[in-house]
Interface confidence: medium
């Protein structure tokens, strides 16, 4: 199962998720780890 | 671990409405995600239905949009299909399933996680 | 929509040898960023669909190095190498490079 890990030890609080690929801006789809606390794919 | 699990009548009668519940446990549906239902017909095509997110967003296949409702109730933990005047064409497995967002990391952007699955008949 | 197009059918195949899946998309899911969005599931009998390819080369965790994918903006192909037993089932691409999500019929992998 592929997981978002959460390594902050607080409330996370997000960005608008964007879900399919035409409401990401072509710069903006390719950053990684926007969340506090970052992102790791299990 | 997350689990999804389904449920709900196995039998609609046309032109009453469907209602399903998802049931999450391992996870809670207000931290993240996108919390999704989606079909399965008879013969294996899939439909993606629609999802509401960790903060309540809904969003819908068009093809659905006048018919379909996807709510939740968070002290539960569970989330909802509401499919009205259905037909016999929308005799399906339905599937919760939980996806990411995009906006973390692209490479996120599917189903990882799926209920089992309940079958629902629409006959008179 | 999007319409994702994949045969019924593979050829049927030996243990230990190996298949190619195809699957053809009606619209570029090449984005600017320079991601395809293409995914494929595998739906084995019984059981709800898994992950196998993320983003169209991408392998899933967990999923064995036998499989691999490749592919243009609109033409895929699933391969498995030493093909075993457990992969038997129906295996789906999507896309969600626009709304609304879109699967493909599933191509259905049998044994010889």
């Known amino acids: 199962d592929a997981e978002f890990r959460h390594d902050s030890g607080y409330e996370v609080h997000h960005q608008k998720l964007v879900f399919f690929a035409e409401d990401v801006g072509s710069n903006k789809g390719a950053i990684i780890g926007l969340m506090v606390g970052g992102v790791v794919i299990a | 671990d997350v689990q999804l699990q389904e449920s709900g009548p196995g039998l609609v009668k046309p032109s009453q409405s469907l209602s399903l519940t998802c049931t999450v446990t391992g996870y809670s549906i207000t931290s993240d995600y996108a919390w999704n239902w989606i079909r399965q017909f008879p013969g294996n095509k899939l439909e993606w239905m629609g999802y509401i997110d960790y903060s309540g967003i809904t969003s819908y296949n068009p093809s659905l949009k006048s018919r379909i409702s996807i709510t939740r109730d968070t002290s539960k933990n569970q989330f909802f299909l509401q499919l009205n005047s259905v037909t016999t064409e929308d005799s399906a497995t339905y599937y919760c399933?939980?996806?990411?967002?995009?906006?973390?990391?692209?490479?996120?952007?599917?189903?990882?996680?799926w209920g089992q699955g309940t079958l629902v008949t629409v006959s008179a | 929509d999007i319409v994702m197009t994949q045969a019924a059918f593979s050829n049927p195949v030996t243990l230990g040898t190996s298949v190619s899946i195809s699957c053809r998309s009606s619209k570029s899911l090449l984005h600017s960023n320079g991601i395809t969005y293409l995914y494929w599931y595998l739906q084995k009998p019984g059981q709800s669909p898994q992950l196998l390819i993320y983003q169209m080369s991408n392998l899933a965790s967990g999923v064995p190095d036998r499989f691999s994918s490749s592919g243009s903006g609109t033409d895929f192909t699933l391969r498995i190498s030493r093909v075993e037993a457990e992969d038997v089932g129906v295996y789906y691409c999507a896309q969600n490079l626009e709304r609304p999500l879109t699967f493909g019929a599933g191509t259905k992998l049998e044994l010889k």
């Open positions: 399933a939980r996806i990411s967002g995009l906006d973390y990391d692209v490479r996120a952007g599917w189903f990882a996680s």
